[in-house]
């Protein structure tokens, strides 16, 4: 929930707003509820329908660390376990992803650049 200060002169100094909940499906027009003391407000809001691009895919996974490099294939792998799926998304419970192994120098550079992305 996000908190928001309101300009002086209004009765409430700090409104707490809940998430925008679409009225249908996963995107489009919806409502956001706000509270301030005993007061409540309901305002129109919109969740963009390209939310997949903006907020991640239909299926979110929690990944293990990358495994060791497989010399025969030149790749390393890691497994992901389903963390959350959009209600109607038919997601695999576990997935396995691979990527090419890189030399130590490249790995170090990549690790610095891509920190927190793996």
């Amino acid at each position: 929930k996000k908190k928001e200060k309101v300009k002086k002169g209004s009765e409430c100094s700090e409104w707490t707003w809940g998430p925008c909940t679409p009225s249908s499906k996963d995107c489009g027009m919806g409502f956001r509820e706000g509270t301030c003391g005993a007061q409540t407000q309901r305002v129109h809001c919109k969740v963009p329908c390209n939310w997949k691009k903006e907020f991640g895919a239909d299926c979110k996974y929690k990944f293990e660390s990358w495994g060791a490099c497989d010399g025969s294939t030149g790749t390393k792998a890691r497994q992901g376990t389903l963390k959350k799926a959009r209600y109607n998304a038919q997601c695999q419970e576990t997935i396995r992803v691979t990527k090419p192994c890189t030399s130590k120098t490249k790995s170090k550079t990549k690790a610095k650049k891509g920190k927190g992305k793996d």
């Epitope: 679409p22 376990t81 963390k83 799926a85 109607n88 038919q90 419970e93």
Partner: antibody
């Protein structure tokens, strides 16, 4: 496979809030949407709302927005639904069900809530 | 809210008969329609998801069809254990809604 355990019955006085539980065992509890459904005696099924244990995202049927509060406790693999200011109209069987679009769903046996003084 | 209308309200059949249950949505819901069976004093049991997808452990005599606003559940050669209530449910938009049900009873 997910098993959902719900108390068979709960008795509550009118106006006294009650918290119904739904304990999951088996496969990962935190990956799937947990739905709550009401069935009044001799009636059909009514969706109350759902919560995702991974981040507590909640979608509530507006009809129940002043009645039901959904929460989860990941440490005990338990989902809860609190009903505020219950009246005799809230006497019903309350089901929880864990939903996956991929594999389908699993239902608890339901809790029969009786609101009576 | 999306309204689901089920028909008929009651269906009286003899074991061995084949039957069709109908569910009509008040607006298009794509294929986001699921069928449940419920016997007295039991939890609902999912029979078909997403209009036509079968569920592990459900007998093959149950099948679903339809898209948009009109959906059907077919039971090929009804068995005595099939008697009970049948509900359709949509997951296309919030709130999720159920039909009022069709009662499948012994003639």
């Amino acid at each position: 496979q997910v098993q959902l355990q719900q108390p068979g019955a709960e008795l509550v006085r009118p106006g006294h809030s009650v918290k119904l539980s739904c304990k999951a065992s088996g496969q990962s509890f935190s990956s799937y949407w947990m739905n709550w459904v009401r069935q009044r005696p001799g009636q059909g099924l009514e969706w109350i709302g759902m919560i995702h244990p991974s981040d507590s995202e909640t979608i509530l049927n507006q009809k129940f927005k002043d009645k039901a509060t959904l929460t989860v406790d990941i440490s005990s693999n338990t989902a809860y639904m609190q009903l505020s200011s219950p009246t005799s109209e809230d006497s019903a069987v309350y089901f929880c069900s864990s939903w996956s679009a991929k594999r389908g769903d699993f239902w608890g046996q339901g809790t029969t809530l009786t609101v009576s003084s | 809210d999306i309204v689901l209308t089920q028909s008929p309200a009651t269906l009286s059949v003899t074991p061995g008969d084949s039957v069709n249950l109908s569910c009509r949505a008040s607006e298009s819901i794509s294929n986001n329609l699921h069928w449940y069976q419920q016997k007295s004093h039991e939890s609902p049991r999912l029979l078909i998801k997403y209009a036509s997808q079968s569920i592990s452990g459900i007998p093959s005599r149950f099948s679903g069809s339809g898209s948009g606003t009109d959906f059907n559940l077919s039971v090929n050669s009804v068995e005595t254990e099939d008697f009970g209530m049948y509900f359709c449910q949509q997951s296309n938009s919030w709130p999720l809604t159920f039909g009022a049900g069709t009662k499948l009873e012994l003639k």
